[in-house]
């Protein structure tokens, strides 16, 4: 009081940091720094992040909040979690779609687009692995279907249909006409 030397940062608690002249308590997540504290070990003036902005961490220096990301509709993305004052929008894919990363070394922040999951049923195949982080993994042909080329072909409904060896093995036709 009355002196001129700025105080050392020896405030109680560990959330004080020098901002300008003084050691200040920072702003909690979801708040931005409007003005630094005006006395040693004081509280900074912090305001809540406006709508559509956020700050995820406690901070001493952010004088504005980050703008919430918009999910990329052209990449078929949807908001899995809406933006809040403390967390950004979490974008992902709607049910029945999976994330296809746009870069080879894929991390959570990598750009991505959403691809429709393979419908194994429509391909007359068993679903071996459900689609979530990657595409559906389809298995063998469903009962009543047999492998033919890349697809599954329906077993013939009568003995008049042609039934090659694989067909006969799967469909149960023993006699060939």
């Amino acid at each position: 009081q009355g002196g001129t030397r700025s105080p050392r940062c020896d405030c109680a608690g560990d959330f004080h940091k020098k901002i300008g002249l003084f050691c200040c308590r920072g702003c909690p997540a979801g708040h931005y720094l409007k003005a630094p504290c005006t006395e040693p070990c004081g509280n900074s003036t912090c305001l809540v992040c406006p709508q559509d902005t956020f700050l995820a961490w406690e901070n001493h220096h952010n004088s504005e909040c980050a703008r919430c990301q918009a999910c990329d509709e052209q990449a078929s993305q949807v908001a899995l979690e809406n933006c809040s004052a403390v967390a950004d929008t979490r974008c992902g894919c709607k049910p029945g779609w999976f994330v296809e990363c746009q870069v080879s070394q894929c991390v959570s922040s990598s750009p991505f687009y959403c691809q429709p999951c393979l419908d194994c049923g429509a391909l007359h195949r068993h679903t071996r692995l459900l689609c979530s982080r990657r595409d559906t993994d389809c298995g063998t042909c469903l009962p009543g279907f047999y492998e033919h080329g890349d697809g599954c072909v329906s077993c013939p409904t009568s003995t008049l249909g042609s039934c090659p060896e694989r067909c006969a093995a799967v469909c149960g036709w023993r006699q060939m006409f």
């Epitope: 009081q1 002196g3 020098k18 901002i19 300008g20 002249l21 630094p36 005006t38 006395e39 004081g42």
Partner: antibody, heavy 116, light 107 residues
Amino acid sequence: EVQLVESGGGSVQPGGSLRLSCAASGFTFSSYGMSWVRQAPGKGLEWISYISSSGGHTYYADSVKGRFTISRDNAKNSLYLQMNSLRAEDTAVYYCARYSGAFDRWGQGTPVTVSS
Amino acid sequence: DIVMTQSPSSLSASVGDRVTITCQASQDITNYLSWYQQKPGKAPKLLINDASNLETGVPSRFSGSGSGTDFTFTISSLQPEDIATYYCQQYDTLPITFGQGTRLEIK
């Protein structure tokens, strides 16, 4: 709109006293530290005093320590500078300024002349 | 006290010129440095805080850089309305101190 308006300047003889005022409007005065900065004729800027938002902490430049007193009345949105034992070298334009790290808002200044 | 040494003390430049002013602190002030513009008979106006943050409404031709002890203020393309005196100021440690100013004139 943020406004700071100084008043109380004038002419005084060496050894005399003056009380400067700074009326604040357009912002939450009680949330900000405030300072007085002066500028002698044809010279640069000189910080002379600072007061915390609550008024509990005050600081002074060596050139005015013991002669000048900074104070504030948050209820009246006003900042003051009581200047005693004035000297010729105190002749200057006196500005009040809002502290937000840097001095982001300044008044227009009030001139003080100390002369016999 | 921290001494702020500003240079040059005055300079003359033409409209459109790139203008640079430097400020040196006698000790480390991190990035707690601001730049002000003062026109004759007027109060100073804050242009830049925290060494490089442009104040809202200040034209983008003004910029600042530096940290520690050495700082630079630049006007990328001088305009007639930029004629003024420019001051640096540290707010790292009390007492707050200013550079002696740089008077900028048009050639």
